[in-house]
C-alpha cells in the first residue's frame, strides 16, 4: 500500500478499515470500486458489487470523495451521495449528500470534487454504497474519487 | 492550543496526531506550516521542512483543507495535493488530489476551498506533504488552511 | 440510527460522539440542530442551545458540512465556521472556516456545498458551535448539513 | 446615503510614515469591499487597494506593495491606509470608494484627501 | 498588465452635441469596463458598469457600449452639466484607467 507492502499488521490492529479508489469500468449505479490494487485498503469490511458490507455492529466514520469534471460546461445538476442498504428496512438511506449547481461558466473546461464525511452508528450486514447523478463525468483517478470508513 | 493551555497528556494518550496551519511565509513547493503556535497540534509525528514525518507504521486519517482567493479572478487551474515521499522508493505518490477549473467569473473577486481526507496505511519514515498549484492565490489563517492526521 | 434501532451499547463502547444534524428552525446564529429524531448520535457529550459541550478534555475529530442554496444567485459572499467558546476566555475562536466569493452564475438557481473537518485538543466544557453568513441561504436537509465530533 | 469621508492628509518628509482614515455612513460598511484610490496632481486614476468586506483578504498595486497597509474596523465602520516609507511620487490626492457586489469597480466615492510628500 | 487607452484626450464641443469618448484595451476584457465622470477638485462618479449598464440615477443620455477591446461612450445630447473628465477603467484583470478624456466647451 501506497508505495511499498503492507506490514504484517499486529493482532490488535484488526482494525475495521477500507478506502476504495475509483474504477473506470463503473457502467451504472452505484459507482464500483477499485478493491485489490494500488492505495487501496481492505479489512474487516467486505466489498460487494459497488458496496463496502458491514460486519461488525458499531461507529464508523465514513468518508468519500468523487472528481467531477468535463470538456465544455454545460452546469448539468450534480449529485454525490453516500446511502445505505439493509434487507430488513425496505429503503435506501441517504447518510451524506453534495449538490452542485451553477458551478462553471458555460462552454468552458471545468473541474469541481464534492467531499462528505461524518460518524455513523452502523449494523452488521448494513450495505454502504456511492451514488452520482452524472457518471460520464466523473474521472476515477484513484487520488481524486474514492470511498472509505474504518470503525472508531 | 485553542486558546488555553494544554493538559499534561494521560500516559495513554500519546496518540500520534498533528494539525499544522497556514504559514504564510511559504515560499515554494511543498507548503510550509506553522507547526508551534496557535491550534497546532503535534505528538509523536515530526514536523520537518514542510513534511509530517510518520515514525511509526500504521492506519491514519490525512487530512487537509486549503483556502485558494484572488482579487481578480482568471480561473487558473488550481489543484491541491497530499503526496507521499519516502527514501526507498524513487517517486512521489499522490495520495489525495482536489483540482478546480472554471470556478469563477472573470474579473470578480473570488474565494473557493479544497478539503481532502482519507485513511493510509503509512509506514515508518513516509513524508508526507501538501503541494498546490498557485502559492500565490492561498490564504494562509490558521482557520482555512491546514494539514494533519491522526493514527487510528 | 441510520433506519434501525441502536445495539445496547457495549460498556467499553461509551465514545464521546456526536452527529447532528440540520434543523430548519434556526433562526438566528449560532445554528441549531436536530439532536434527537433521524441518524443522529450523541453520547458522552451534551447538546445545548446550538452547541456541542465537551466533558472530557481530550482529541477530538470535529467536523461539520453546510449545504448552501439558492433560487437566484447574486454571489453574496458565504462563510462557515466551526467556533469555540469557553467561559474562561473572553473571545470566540474560530477553529475551522470556509468561504465562498463569485461561485454561481448571476440570476442562476444555484447549490455548493462546504465541508470542514480536522484534529483539536478540546478541553472540558468547551462549547462547540457552526456558524453560517446567509442563514436563507442554507438548506437543512438532514444528509447535507450536519455538525459532529468523535473523541480519538 | 452612502457616504465616505477621508481624513489624514498632509504633508511628509520623504521617507516618513502617514495614516489615512476613510469614516463610512449610510450602508451596512461590514459587507462591502473598500479600495483606496489615487490621483496625482493633474493626473489620471490609479488604483492603490483593496480589502475585503471581512478584513480578511488585502491586495495591492504592486507600486505600493510592501509599504502600504490597507486595514479596517468594521466595529467602527472606518477604513484605513498605513503608509511607510513614502517617496515624492506618492504625492497625491487619495479617495477611498466602495467596490460593488465584488466586481473591483466603484459605485460610491469619498472627497478626497491630499497626501503630499516633499522635502 | 492590461493597457486601457483612451481617445481623444480632449475633446471640444457644444451643448446638445452628440459626443462619442473612445477607450481601447491592449487585450480583450470581454464587457468587464466602467465609465466615471470627474469634474475639478471632486471624486469621480460612477456611470456605467459591465460597458452598457447605466447605473441608477444616471441620466439617460449617458450611453456605454462596445465588448473585447473597443468601447465608446456616447453622450446623446450634451448639457452643461456634463462638461468633466471621463475615465474607463477595466475590471477583467485586477484594476486599470485609461488616462482620461477632458470634455470642454468649444
Known amino acids: 500500500q501506497i508505495g511499498h507492502p503492507s506490514p504484517p499488521p499486529e493482532k490488535k490492529e484488526l482494525r475495521k478499515v477500507a478506502h476504495l479508489t475509483g474504477k473506470s469500468n463503473s457502467r451504472s449505479m452505484p459507482l464500483e470500486w477499485e478493491d485489490t490494487y494500488g492505495i487501496v485498503l481492505l479489512s474487516g469490511v467486505k466489498y460487494k458489487k459497488g458496496g463496502l458490507v458491514i460486519n461488525e455492529t458499531g461507529l464508523y466514520f465514513v468518508y468519500s470523495k468523487v472528481y467531477f469534471r468535463g470538456q465544455s460546461c454545460n452546469n448539468l445538476p450534480l449529485s454525490h451521495k453516500v446511502y445505505m442498504r439493509n434487507s430488513k428496512y425496505p429503503q435506501d438511506l441517504v447518510m451524506m449528500e453534495g449538490k452542485m449547481m451553477s458551478y462553471c461558466t458555460t462552454g468552458q473546461m471545468w473541474a469541481r470534487s464534492s467531499y462528505l464525511g461524518a460518524v455513523f452508528n452502523l449494523t452488521s450486514a448494513d450495505h454502504l454504497y456511492v451514488n452520482v447523478s452524472e457518471l460520464s463525468l466523473v474521472n476515477f483517478e484513484e487520488s481524486q474519487t474514492f470511498f472509505g470508513l474504518y470503525k472508531l | 492550543q485553542i486558546g488555553h493551555p494544554s493538559p499534561p497528556p494521560e500516559k495513554k494518550e500519546l496518540r500520534k496526531v498533528a494539525h499544522l496551519t497556514g504559514k504564510s511565509n511559504s515560499r515554494s513547493m511543498p507548503l510550509e506550516w506553522e507547526d508551534t503556535y496557535g491550534i497546532v497540534l503535534l505528538s509523536g509525528v515530526k514536523y520537518k521542512k514542510g513534511g509530517l514525518v510518520i515514525n511509526e507504521t500504521g492506519l491514519y486519517f490525512v487530512y487537509s483543507k486549503v483556502y485558494f482567493r484572488g482579487q481578480s479572478c482568471n480561473n487558473l487551474p488550481l489543484s491541491h495535493k497530499v503526496y507521499m515521499r519516502n527514501s526507498k522508493y524513487p517517486q512521489d505518490l499522490v495520495m489525495m488530489e482536489g483540482k478546480m477549473m472554471s470556478y469563477c467569473t472573470t474579473g470578480q473577486m473570488w474565494a473557493r476551498s479544497s478539503y481532502l481526507g482519507a485513511v493510509f496505511n503509512l509506514t515508518s519514515a513516509d513524508h508526507l506533504y501538501v503541494n498546490v498549484s498557485e502559492l500565490s492565490l492561498v490564504n494562509f489563517e490558521e482557520s482555512q488552511t491546514f494539514f494533519g492526521l491522526y493514527k487510528l | 440510527q441510520i433506519g434501525h434501532p441502536s445495539p445496547p451499547p457495549e460498556k467499553k463502547e461509551l465514545r464521546k460522539v456526536a452527529h447532528l444534524t440540520g434543523k430548519s428552525n434556526s433562526r438566528s446564529m449560532p445554528l441549531e440542530w436536530e439532536d434527537t429524531y433521524g441518524i443522529v448520535l450523541l453520547s458522552g457529550v451534551k447538546y445545548k442551545k446550538g452547541g456541542l459541550v465537551i466533558n472530557e478534555t481530550g482529541l477530538y475529530f470535529v467536523y461539520s458540512k453546510v449545504y448552501f442554496r439558492g433560487q437566484s444567485c447574486n454571489n453574496l459572499p458565504l462563510s462557515h465556521k466551526v467556533y469555540m467558546r469557553n467561559s474562561k476566555y473572553p473571545q470566540d475562536l474560530v477553529m475551522m472556516e470556509g468561504k465562498m466569493m463569485s461561485y454561481c452564475t448571476t440570476g442562476q438557481m444555484w447549490a455548493r456545498s462546504s465541508y470542514l473537518g480536522a484534529v483539536f485538543n478540546l478541553t472540558s466544557a468547551d462549547h462547540l458551535y457552526v456558524n453560517v453568513s446567509e442563514l436563507s441561504l442554507v438548506n437543512f436537509e438532514e444528509s447535507q448539513t450536519f455538525f459532529g465530533l468523535y473523541k480519538l | 446615503q452612502v457616504q465616505l469621508v477621508e481624513s489624514g492628509g498632509g504633508v511628509v518628509q520623504p521617507g516618513r510614515s502617514l495614516r489615512l482614515s476613510c469614516a463610512a455612513s449610510?450602508?451596512?460598511?461590514?459587507?462591502?469591499?473598500i479600495h483606496w484610490v489615487r490621483q496625482a496632481p493633474g493626473k489620471g486614476l490609479e488604483w492603490v487597494a483593496v480589502i475585503w468586506y471581512d478584513g480578511s483578504d488585502k491586495f495591492y498595486a504592486d507600486s505600493v506593495k510592501g509599504r502600504f497597509t490597507i486595514s479596517r474596523d468594521n466595529s467602527k465602520d472606518t477604513l484605513y491606509l498605513e503608509m511607510n516609507s513614502l517617496r515624492a511620487e506618492d504625492t497625491a490626492m487619495y479617495y477611498c470608494a466602495r467596490d460593488r457586489d465584488n466586481w473591483n469597480y466603484f459605485d460610491y466615492w469619498g472627497q478626497g484627501t491630499l497626501v503630499t510628500v516633499s522635502s | 498588465d492590461i493597457q486601457m487607452t483612451q481617445s481623444p484626450s480632449t475633446l471640444s464641443a457644444s451643448v446638445g452635441d452628440r459626443v462619442t469618448i473612445t477607450c481601447r484595451a491592449s487585450?480583450?476584457?470581454?464587457?468587464?469596463l466602467a465609465w466615471y465622470q470627474q469634474k475639478p477638485g471632486k471624486a469621480p462618479k460612477f456611470l456605467i458598469y459591465q460597458a452598457s449598464s447605466l447605473e441608477s440615477g444616471v441620466p439617460s443620455r449617458f450611453s456605454g457600449s462596445g465588448s473585447g477591446t473597443e468601447f465608446t461612450l456616447t453622450i446623446s445630447s450634451l448639457q452643461p452639466d456634463d462638461f468633466a473628465t471621463y475615465y474607463c477603467q477595466q475590471y477583467n484583470s485586477y484594476i486599470t484607467f485609461g488616462q482620461g478624456t477632458r470634455l470642454e466647451i468649444k
Open positions: 449610510g450602508f451596512t460598511f461590514s459587507t462591502y469591499g
Open positions: 487585450q480583450s476584457i470581454s464587457s468587464w
